[in-house]
């Protein structure tokens, strides 16, 4: 193998790997024909002048997870064939100017998870062929104008997990080939108008977990190819009416965890490829007519954990493809009988943790394919006669934690429940709240002094692909839940945000900071 250092392993395929704490300097002599070199998990603290001088055929160089804190400017001299260079997971605070000079073939440069305090235009001015630049997980507070001006071929730029407080509108102006821009987990409070105007080929823009309060109306108007836009966990309080109007390719939009108070009609659209919209954890108080009318392919709509008290009868117009609708943990007291009429393909609806006092008899009239309805923890005292009769596929119905009034008017509901007991699940059954003499007794077996014929309990369809329920009686909070936590439910196990119950502000469905996309 043309000489392999004792602390390394060398393969026939010209691959060299040097690992271990006993390594304190770049091993020598390295095989002259090496094409891939990995130096991982060592105690190397610095790279001196030209340690790779004799391996000029090198294509990939990974120097990761070391103690590296200092590099001399000529460390990578004579590596003109190098295409991939990773210095990730080290302790670099400063990059010397000219470090990447002569790396004319370099396409991928990974500098993530270091301690870099600043970058300068001169750092990357020689890297004209660079396609990927990873700078996430550093301590960058600002990006100077011109920093990326020479990287005209760049397709992927990650600046996430830094300390950026503002972005110059000119910093990305020459990156016309950029497809992925990640700015997540910074301290950005606003994005100047025009910042993304030059990014005509952008497909993914990650702005989640910042402190953005306002979006300028035309912020995304030049990004017609945008497919994924992450805006979750910011401080956005309103959406300018036209902000999403020029995004026909969008297939992922996250807005959860903001401060949105209202959504104007037609705010989303047209977005023919958007299939899921997550709007939970905002401050939305009402839904006007046609607010989602451009989202004709939407399959999943999550509106849980808002403050919705009013839904206009035409709010869900256009959502003909919707399969799952989550409205749990809001402030709904009443629903118009026609509000779900257009949702002909709806399978799962979660309305638990609201203040619903009654339901119109025709509320589910046109939603014949419903399989799961969550109505627990509301203020329901009774339900209209025949409200569920036409729902032949219904196999999960949650009615517990309501103040059922067990007088003679409850008989039709009681009889239906008796016939359909398997649909109620086995863990928690609805119980009477009034009159006082029957409080706490099961609604299904309560004696209301009227003879009830013996009934045959029919077989119920197997459980559907219902939304995410909690499978555990107590809900973990994000301070203690690891990212491997699985929430599973008492009856099913689909711990989907559409129906998860949340008992306090910390219980965000086992979601941790690491899970923010």
């Amino acid at each position: 193998y043309h000489g392999c250092p004792s602390e390394c392993t060398c393969s026939r395929a010209s691959q060299v790997e040097c690992t271990g704490a006993r390594i304190v300097a770049v091993p020598t002599p390295l095989p002259w024909n090496a094409m891939s070199l990995q130096i991982l998990n060592t105690h190397i603290t610095e790279l001196n002048e030209s340690p790779f001088l004799n391996i000029s055929a090198l294509i990939a160089l990974r120097i990761e997870k070391n103690e590296l804190s200092r590099i001399t400017p000529g460390a990578f001299r004579n590596l003109g064939s190098l295409r991939y260079l990773s210095l990730a997971n080290n302790k670099l605070q400063v990059l010397p100017i000219g470090l990447f000079q002569g790396l004319d073939s370099l396409e991928s440069l990974l500098l993530s998870s270091n301690q870099l305090l600043q970058i300068q235009p001169a750092h990357f001015s020689q890297c004209s062929n660079l396609k990927e630049l990873q700078l996430h997980g550093n301590h960058l507070e600002y990006i100077p104008d011109g920093a990326f001006d020479h990287l005209v071929g760049l397709t992927k730029l990650n600046l996430g997990k830094n300390s950026l407080t503002h972005i110059s509108p000119r910093v990305f102006q020459h990156l016309g080939n950029l497809q992925v821009l990640r700015l997540y987990e910074n301290r950005l409070t606003d994005i100047p108008m025009g910042t993304f105007d030059g990014l005509v080929n952008l497909q993914e823009l990650a702005l989640q977990q910042n402190q953005i309060g306002l979006l300028s109306p035309g912020l995304f108007h030049n990004n017609h190819n945008l497919q994924r836009l992450y805006l979750s966990n910011n401080h956005i309080s309103q959406l300018p009416p036209s902000v999403f109007m020029q995004l026909p390719q969008l297939n992922r939009l996250t807005l959860f965890g903001n401060s949105l108070k209202e959504l104007s009609p037609g705010i989303f659209g047209p977005m023919p490829n958007l299939r899921e919209l997550w709007l939970y954890d905002n401050h939305i108080s009402s839904l006007p007519d046609n607010v989602f009318s451009n989202l004709r392919q939407l399959q999943v709509l999550i509106l849980s954990r808002n403050q919705i008290s009013f839904i206009s009868p035409g709010a869900f117009n256009g959502l003909t493809e919707l399969r799952e609708l989550s409205l749990h943990t809001n402030a709904l007291q009443d629903l118009d009988g026609n509000v779900f009429r257009m949702l002909a393909n709806l399978q799962n609806i979660s309305l638990q943790n609201n203040r619903l006092r009654q339901l119109p008899g025709n509320i589910f009239a046109n939603v014949n394919g419903l399989m799961a309805i969550q109505l627990q923890n509301n203020q329901l005292e009774n339900l209209p006669l025949g409200i569920f009769d036409h729902l032949g596929k219904l196999c999960e119905l949650r009615l517990y934690d309501n103040p059922w009034r067990c007088d003679s008017d409850i008989l039709p509901l009681r009889n239906w429940l008796l016939l359909n007991q398997p649909r109620l699940g086995t863990d928690t059954v609805p119980v009477c709240f009034s009159p006082a003499n029957v409080r706490g007794q099961s609604l299904i077996i309560i004696n209301v002094n009227v003879a009830v014929p013996s009934v045959h309990v029919p077989e119920v369809p197997s459980y559907p692909e219902t939304p995410w329920y909690p499978d555990t009686p107590s809900y973990p909070d994000t301070t203690s839940v690891s990212s491997t936590t699985e929430l599973t439910s008492p009856v099913e196990d689909y711990t989907d945000l559409t129906t998860i119950q949340v008992t306090d502000d910390r219980s965000v469905w086992g979601m941790t900071q690491a899970q923010s996309g």
Epitope: R228, N251, R252, R275, E276, R296, Q297, Q299, V300, T320, E321, R323, E324, A344, N345, Q347, M371, S462, Y463, P464, E465, W468, V481, S483, T484, T485, E486, L487, T488, D493, Y494, T495, D496, L497, I500, W509, G510, M511, Q515, S516, G517
Partner: antibody
């Protein structure tokens, strides 16, 4: 390049458990659904369930409820499926696969992990 | 659960000829916009590979000799001109409810 790399073949005794891993790379792990599919020897495909790494939420085929536990570790972009109380009929190749949206097709698949249950 | 019945179980077709595989669902898996039916190809010792999603949408990178059609309960996968590398088992899958697969159709060269 999108890749799902699964752990190696396992031979297990009846009554024991096995944990199969699926390491994802080349895409944003938390942004996709991860499905698990069973294929018994000479048989067709059977959907076990899915996990959504963004929230750790799961959905099982009722047949595998109590048999398969699906979890994720987002720090290592790895999905896991643990099968408990193994029986001979659990002998199969198990695949993980990726789906863009919940109802979408599975567009990338792992190479499969063979689990053999034998005394 | 929705039952998917594929026909035929196996199919022998000459190179360059058309191959047609059918999949019937026990209930409709379509809306006015979409059919929640997908097609996969599996070669021996390999994982399945997505060919067609939502009944008729060709997955990127898949040769255009593959096409899908149908709605409601009846769906078809067509290979317009069979190539040697198309020898495999083909499966339909529905994602309307709990996902289920068809039993598979083995395609061979005559």
């Amino acid at each position: 390049e999108v890749q799902l790399v699964q752990s190696g073949a396992e031979v297990k005794k009846p009554g024991s458990s096995v944990k199969v891993s699926c390491k994802a790379s080349g895409f944003t792990f938390t942004d996709y659904y991860i499905h698990w599919v069973k294929q018994a020897p000479g048989q067709g495909l059977e959907w076990i369930g899915l996990v959504y790494p963004y929230i750790g939420g799961t959905n099982h085929n009722q047949k595998f409820k109590g048999k398969a536990t699906l979890t994720v570790d987002t720090s290592t972009t790895t999905a896991y499926m643990e099968m408990s109380s193994l029986r001979s009929e659990d002998t199969a190749v198990y695949y993980c696969a990726r789906g863009d949206n919940k109802y979408d097709a599975m567009d990338y698949w792992g190479q499969g992990t063979t689990v053999t249950v034998s005394s | 659960d929705i039952v998917l019945t594929q026909s035929p179980d196996s199919l022998a077709v000459s190179l360059g000829e058309r191959a047609t595989i059918n999949c019937r669902a026990s209930q409709s898996v379509s809306t006015s916009s979409y059919s929640y039916m997908h097609w996969y190809q599996q070669k021996p010792g390999q994982p399945p590979k997505l060919l067609i999603k939502y009944a008729s949408s060709l997955e990127s990178g898949v040769p255009d000799r593959f096409s899908g059609s149908g709605s409601g309960t009846d769906f078809t996968l067509t290979i317009s001109s069979l190539q040697a590398e198309d020898v495999a088992v083909y499966y339909c899958e529905q994602s309307w409810e709990i996902r289920t697969f068809g039993g598979g159709t083995k395609v061979e060269i005559k």
